[in-house]
């Protein structure tokens, strides 16, 4: 008799998930020699242990603690770049500005970036058919809990001036329901963080509006100010030119507004 399997609303585990996580771990240690002490097999075992044989709607931050411990990493706390709904540009930026870090530039973020995973209660199988959707099924699923856990820790580690890249093309430039709005903003430590500086990235070539005056940015400013952290905001009118100027700051065209 075929065993009944829960059908979730979200896509199933990414194909080659175990191989991808293990390969990414080894690649990460290859390109970050300071992380060569990490035992990638143990990392995979801890990752697997967080969700295998567990109900995929009943995952807790506690389940990920062994993985968090193995992936402990020190990044310069004053060089943190958060982002919301504009991941690609944030990553292009840290590729050029090598001393700044997004969450995906850390081992744990790099391991899980763009992947989906879940298991099934009481079986050691990985579910490649479907996984819970955050909205339609449950919020305490393996992927959501993972990102909530690592995002919280990343924000808690930040100090001095923290930067956040926001997508000015979206109807909600700051979205309280995003990981940035629901987790990271509330876990910045006022005793360590002096300022949150938002970079609002414009989408349209001819868009010269001051998006720092957007109501959702004002809402972000209010939340941050209430937490005794200063807030500042900059418009990035030309993201392509912005990246080019990060690469070549001495370029004569880089003195004007970008």
């Amino acid at each position: 008799v075929p065993r009944w399997r829960q059908q979730w609303s979200g896509p199933g585990t990414t194909k080659r998930f175990p191989e991808t996580v293990l390969a990414r771990c080894v690649k990460y240690t290859e390109i970050h020699p300071e992380m060569r002490h990490v035992d990638c097999q143990s990392v995979w075992d801890a990752f697997k242990g967080a969700f295998i044989s567990k109900h995929p709607c009943n995952i807790t931050e506690e389940d990920y603690q062994p993985l968090m411990k193995l992936g402990t990493q020190t990044v310069p706390c004053n060089k943190i770049l958060l982002w919301s709904r504009i991941k690609d540009l944030a990553h292009q930026f840290t590729q050029v500005q090598r001393d700044m870090f997004t969450l995906e530039d850390t081992l744990l973020g790099y391991l899980a970036d763009d992947l989906t995973w879940c298991g099934e209660f009481n079986t050691s199988k990985i579910n490649y058919q479907s996984c819970p959707d955050w909205r339609k099924d449950c919020s305490n699923n393996p992927v959501s809990v993972f990102w909530k856990t690592v995002s919280r820790r990343f924000a808690e580690a930040a100090c001095d001036v923290v930067h956040v890249m926001l997508n000015g093309s979206r109807s909600k430039i700051f979205d309280k329901n995003s990981t940035f709005g629901s987790v990271e903003v509330h876990n910045l430590q006022p005793e360590k963080v002096q300022t949150l500086e938002a970079w609002v990235i414009h989408g349209g070539r001819e868009d010269s509006r001051d998006l720092c005056q957007d109501p959702t940015i004002k809402e972000l400013e209010s939340i941050i100010s209430k937490r005794n952290i200063q807030f500042s905001c900059k418009n990035i009118y030309r993201p392509d030119k912005f990246l080019q100027c990060v690469k070549n700051p001495e370029d004569s065209s880089c003195t004007s507004e970008i």
Epitope: K27, P33, R36
Partner: antibody, heavy 120, light 107 residues
Framework: QMQLVQSGAEVKKTGSSVKVSCKAS????????MHWVRQAPGQALEWMGW????????DYAQKFQDRVTITRDRSMSTAYMELSSLRSEDTAMYYC?????????????WGQGTLVTVSS | DIQMTQSPSSVSASVGDRVTITCRAS??????LAWYQQKPGKAPKLLIY???SLADGVPSRFSGSGSGTDFTLTISSLQPEDFATYYC?????????FGQGTKLEIK
């Protein structure tokens, strides 16, 4: 079986650019960092840089920073190394190489090499 | 950058001889060292990784030792196919660097 096959020999003029390709087969291209190493005639090996084929992230030796660009085409499982503003000292054999994950970070697999000759 | 210094730069030996090549790093590289063999017109071949581990398919007459800054490649009994150039390489830190090579010639 695992193979790295490079493009053919090139003869280039001083000041021009060269783009060497390295086609990977027999393994998942995105699972391994790809490195580029060169060797001038009668000289030692010299590491130039790496690319993470999954994301396209790169890092270069300071010496080549301003002149080298390493890229990849995931759909073709191919890495590329482009060197610009060529000078006679760039005449060398250029290799792509990768580790085996089981052999520390030594380069267990190498392409056959591409000879680039720069003439004035 | 970490400097890798090999000695000797060339050595003449006969089949059956025991040969030792040394490699010194300008700073501590722990055991993050590889040895390669290269024959004319060919790509290098990995012999030893992590200073003392033998790569797959490499004959057991090759061995590596050392850690920190001083390393040795030993060929216990030279075979005709061993006449080649040998390079050490550190992968402790970027940029990865190679020694200048040791040419092993027939006496």
């Amino acid at each position: 079986q695992m193979q790295l096959v490079q493009s053919g020999a090139e003869v280039k003029k001083t000041g021009s650019s060269v783009k060497v390709s390295c086609k990977a087969s027999g393994y998942t291209f995105t699972d391994y960092i790809m490195h580029w190493v060169r060797q001038a005639p009668g000289q030692a090996l010299e590491w130039m840089g790496w690319i993470d084929p999954e994301y396209g992230r790169t890092d270069y030796a300071q010496k080549f920073q301003d002149r080298v660009t390493i890229t990849r085409d995931r759909s073709m499982s191919t890495a590329y190394m482009e060197l610009s503003s060529l000078r006679s000292e760039d005449t060398a054999m250029y290799y792509c190489a990768r580790s085996a994950h089981t052999t520390g970070f030594g380069f267990a697999y190498w392409g056959q090499g591409t000879l680039v000759t720069v003439s004035s | 950058d970490i400097q890798m210094t090999q000695s000797p730069s060339s050595v003449s030996a006969s089949v059956g001889d025991r040969v030792t090549i040394t490699c010194r790093a300008s700073e501590d590289i722990y055991s993050n060292l590889a040895w390669y063999q290269q024959k004319p017109g060919k790509a290098p071949k990995l012999l030893i990784y992590d200073a003392n581990s033998l790569a797959d398919g490499v004959p057991s007459r090759f061995s590596g030792s050392g850690s920190g800054t001083d390393f040795t490649l030993t060929i216990s009994s030279l075979q005709p196919e061993d006449f080649a150039t040998y390079y050490c390489q550190q992968y402790n830190n970027y940029p990865y660097t190679f020694g200048q090579g040791t040419k092993l010639e027939i006496k």
